[in-house]
């Protein structure tokens, strides 16, 4: 799978994580920080 950093327009897309662009899948993906989940790392869990 080809990946690259997200475009600058997606700054802030991932609330608590790193945004990765999955080129072959034509979509952005959020790699969440520890303790966060959700498509955009918007949910905190203990």
């Amino acid at each position: 799978v080809s990946i690259t950093k997200c475009n600058s327009d997606m700054n802030g897309y991932c609330l608590h994580g790193q945004c990765i662009y999955l080129v072959d899948m034509s979509q952005n993906y959020c790699r969440c920080e520890v303790g966060y989940t959700g498509v955009r790392c918007e949910h905190f869990y203990l």
Epitope: T4, N7, D9, M10, Y13, S26, V39, E42
Partner: antibody, heavy 116, light 106 residues
Framework: QDQLVQSGAEVKKPGASVKVSCKAS????????IQWVRQAPGQGLEWMGR????????KYREKFEGRVTITADTSTNTAYMELSSLRSEDTAVYYC?????????WGQGTLVTVSS | DIQMTQSPSSLSASVGDRVTITCKAS??????IAWYQQKPGQAPRLLIQ???TLQPGVPSRFSGSGSGTDYTFTISSLQPEDIATYYC????????FGGGTKVEIK
């Protein structure tokens, strides 16, 4: 199956406002950005602006600033684009476009006609 | 705002010809360019994103290349069904479409 279903065609008088809706099904708009693009008859595609429904944050093209308002209601999974002070040059097909989780998935378009 | 200058605005070519369309950005767009095909009365159809990544179901005669500010879209062998208007779109910083290229058969 993911879908963006837009409201029906509108005819408006100059100076009036129009509000076009874009209802998502099959996915949660909070996971995406919703863009709005328009196309006047026989003309090219023009990006108008977008909303991040999760945060409620908007970005607009400079030429539309102050005249366009993009909103989202996450409880109904629907985005809206309102354009005010309509003029004949605003006659166009207006599209909502999903981006983020999937690159550029388009609604079917809504024709807005501005005529006196 | 980033400007996208697309050329030519129209072209006429024969079936089987190689067709090339260019888009020049006013600043580096880091390969974040997409190409759309639009036929009359239809919504635009995404052909290519991230400069050269072909979408599923798109014929391999369509291709894209470029970097920095200069990008190219190519139809290696024009087919009658390719008659349409083609648009580039930069999506690095917000979004800007090129002016479009109308492709006709000679």
């Amino acid at each position: 199956q993911d879908q963006l279903v837009q409201s029906g065609a509108e005819v408006k008088k100059p100076g009036a406002s129009v509000k076009v809706s874009c209802k998502a099904s099959g996915f949660n708009i909070k996971d995406t950005y919703i863009q709005w693009v328009r196309q006047a008859p026989g003309q090219g595609l023009e990006w108008m602006g977008r909303i991040d429904p999760l945060r409620g944050r908007t970005k607009y093209r400079e030429k539309f600033e102050g005249r366009v308002t993009i909103t989202a209601d996450t409880s109904t999974n629907t985005a809206y684009m309102e354009l005010s002070s309509l003029r004949s040059e605003d006659t166009a097909v207006y599209y909502c476009v999903r981006s983020g989780t999937l690159f550029d998935f388009w609604g079917q378009g809504t024709l807005v006609t501005v005529s006196s | 705002d980033i400007q996208m200058t697309q050329s030519p605005s129209s072209l006429s070519a024969s079936v089987g010809d190689r067709v090339t369309i260019t888009c020049k950005a006013s600043q580096d767009i880091h390969k974040y360019i997409a190409w759309y095909q639009q036929k009359p009365g239809q919504a635009p159809r995404l052909l290519i994103q991230y400069t050269s990544t072909l979408q599923p179901g798109v014929p391999s005669r369509f291709s894209g290349s470029g970097s920095g500010t200069d990008y190219t879209f190519t139809i290696s062998s024009l087919q009658p069904e390719d008659i349409a208007t083609y648009y580039c779109l930069q999506y690095d910083n917000l979004r800007t479409f090129g002016g479009g290229t109308k492709v006709e058969i000679k």
